[in-house]
């Protein structure tokens, strides 16, 4: 799994919407993969992490001055949606085909 | 200034072009604000954090596994462009009116 | 090696028409802004006229002093600037340089072209 | 439209001695912080040269002799060993706005 010491990149988070008290209303599915972008923005920043310019700034500065400025961070830069079955204010089970930005497609150096 | 403890927001960030090794290239500007996302992503995350549900997602796991699962991220979601003069490849300075994703905008969890 | 040179001046009467040209070489002459600049015998620089690229729709701009006589045009596909001058005064009278630059700056001179306005 | 100034009209200064000539804008010429400033040298029967852009930036092959300075309205160009090559008029001329406008140029001379 990637950790502090490994470079930005999607790893898995599997959700139980009951962890999370979301089960109160979204009925299914019980769970699902949300994906979390784990690991360092390190200098150079790779093409892969698209970065943006104010990221790679802030890497070269953070390179400079540590202490002061903090390292560009990893996170989703593209979400995807999910299909949940949930109900409605009347209590009626209705399908939402695309519950967006739910689940990480990519992640990046901001 | 926003440390650790506060939360996220943006603080100014002033980059010497010298220090990041940019002014063989970029003429002037000498220095720009581009500002810095800074604080944490604490639940409940505010609107004015514009979070996506992912991060809201995040952020519950967070609380329930803290060990397991990272806080959401304060990163830039929105920049702005600042001018530049720089050397053409004829050695002749020229303005860039919008040298675009330099300056920070909006920070917000991610 | 950057040249320009210029080309058309002479002898004119007031009231007449004259077209300079300026034939560019050593550079990419598409990528730049080109301007005229004039001086006076024995005065100072002043500018003419530039226009942009094709990418500003070859967009112009002109000192007020010859706006609407004065025409600035291009020919990317032969490297050259010309300067339409209709109804010449003799306060036209100048050495007229062709200039090439950036949005920020005249970095190329030519050695500029005499044009004599004189009854 | 931005008028500049310049000062004196001219100057004469012994070889090896320093040259000093001013230009003012009627109004700021600096923007995004940059100064749209520039400092041309014109030699008898010669195109002008650029010699300082940006304020205070040496043109391409210009002698480290010749420096410039200021900001917003006020501008210096300096020369700190005047040599036999450096009599010229100078002008300074700023394009932050079009129309691009010239100072009016300082002859220097050698005394």
């Known amino acids: 799994s990637a950790g502090a010491g490994s470079h930005c990149q999607k790893t898995s988070l599997r959700v139980n919407f009951e962890d999370i008290g979301w089960d109160s209303w979204i009925i299914a599915p019980k769970e699902y993969e949300a994906y979390e972008c784990k690991g360092g923005c390190f200098f150079p920043l790779a093409d892969d992490v698209t970065p943006t310019k104010h990221a790679i700034v802030q890497t070269l500065v953070h390179l400079k001055f540590p202490t002061k400025v903090g390292k560009a961070c990893c996170v989703p830069t593209k979400l995807s949606p999910i299909s949940v079955l949930y109900k409605d204010d009347m209590g009626v089970p209705t399908l939402k085909y695309h519950y967006e930005g739910m689940s990480v497609a990519e992640c990046g150096c901001r | 200034s926003a440390g650790a403890g506060s939360h996220c927001q943006k603080t100014s960030l002033r980059v010497n072009f010298e220090d990041i090794g940019w002014d063989s290239w970029i003429i002037a500007p000498k220095e720009y604000e581009a500002y810095e996302c800074k604080g944490g992503c604490f639940f409940p995350l505010a609107d004015d954090v514009t979070p996506t549900k992912h991060a809201i997602v995040q952020t519950l796991v967070h609380l329930k596994f803290p060990t397991k699962v990272g806080k959401a991220c304060c990163v830039p979601t929105k920049l702005s462009p600042i001018s530049v003069l720089y050397k053409d490849d004829m050695g002749v300075p020229t303005l860039k009116y919008h040298y675009e994703g330099m300056s920070v905008a909006e920070c917000g969890c991610r | 090696e950057v040249q320009l040179v210029e080309s058309g001046g002479g002898l004119v009467q007031p009231g007449g028409s004259l077209r300079l040209s300026c034939a560019a070489s050593?550079?990419?002459?598409?990528?730049?802004?080109m301007n005229w600049v004039r001086q006076a015998p024995g005065k100072g620089l002043e500018w003419v006229a530039h226009?942009?690229?094709?990418?500003?729709?070859?967009?112009?701009h002109y000192a007020e002093s010859v706006r609407g006589r004065f025409t600035i045009s291009r020919d990317d596909s032969k490297n050259s600037l010309y300067l339409q001058m209709n109804s010449l005064k003799t306060e036209d009278t100048a050495i007229y340089y062709c200039?090439?630059?950036?949005?920020?700056?005249?970095?190329?001179w030519g050695q500029g072209t005499l044009v004599t306005v004189s009854s | 439209d931005i008028v500049m100034t310049q000062s004196p009209d001219s100057l004469a200064v012994s070889l090896g001695e320093r040259a000093t000539i001013n230009c003012r804008a009627s109004?700021?010429?600096?923007?995004?912080?940059?100064?749209?400033m520039n400092w041309f040298q014109q030699k008898p029967g010669q195109p002008p040269k650029l010699l300082i852009y940006?304020?205070?930036n040496q043109g391409s092959g210009v002698p480290d002799r010749f420096s410039g300075s200021g900001s917003g309205t006020d501008f210096t160009l300096t020369i700190s060993s005047l040599q036999a090559e450096d009599v010229a008029v100078y002008f300074c001329?700023?394009?932050?706005?079009?129309?691009?406008?010239f100072g009016q140029g300082t002859k220097l001379e050698i005394k």
């Open positions: 200039t090439g630059g950036s949005n920020y700056v005249f970095a190329f």
């Open positions: 050593g550079f990419t002459f598409s990528n730049y802004w």
């Open positions: 226009i942009r690229l094709k990418s500003d729709n070859y967009a112009t």
């Open positions: 109004e700021s010429v600096d923007n995004y912080g940059i100064s749209f």
């Open positions: 940006a304020a205070s």
């Open positions: 001329q700023q394009s932050k706005e079009v129309p691009w406008t």
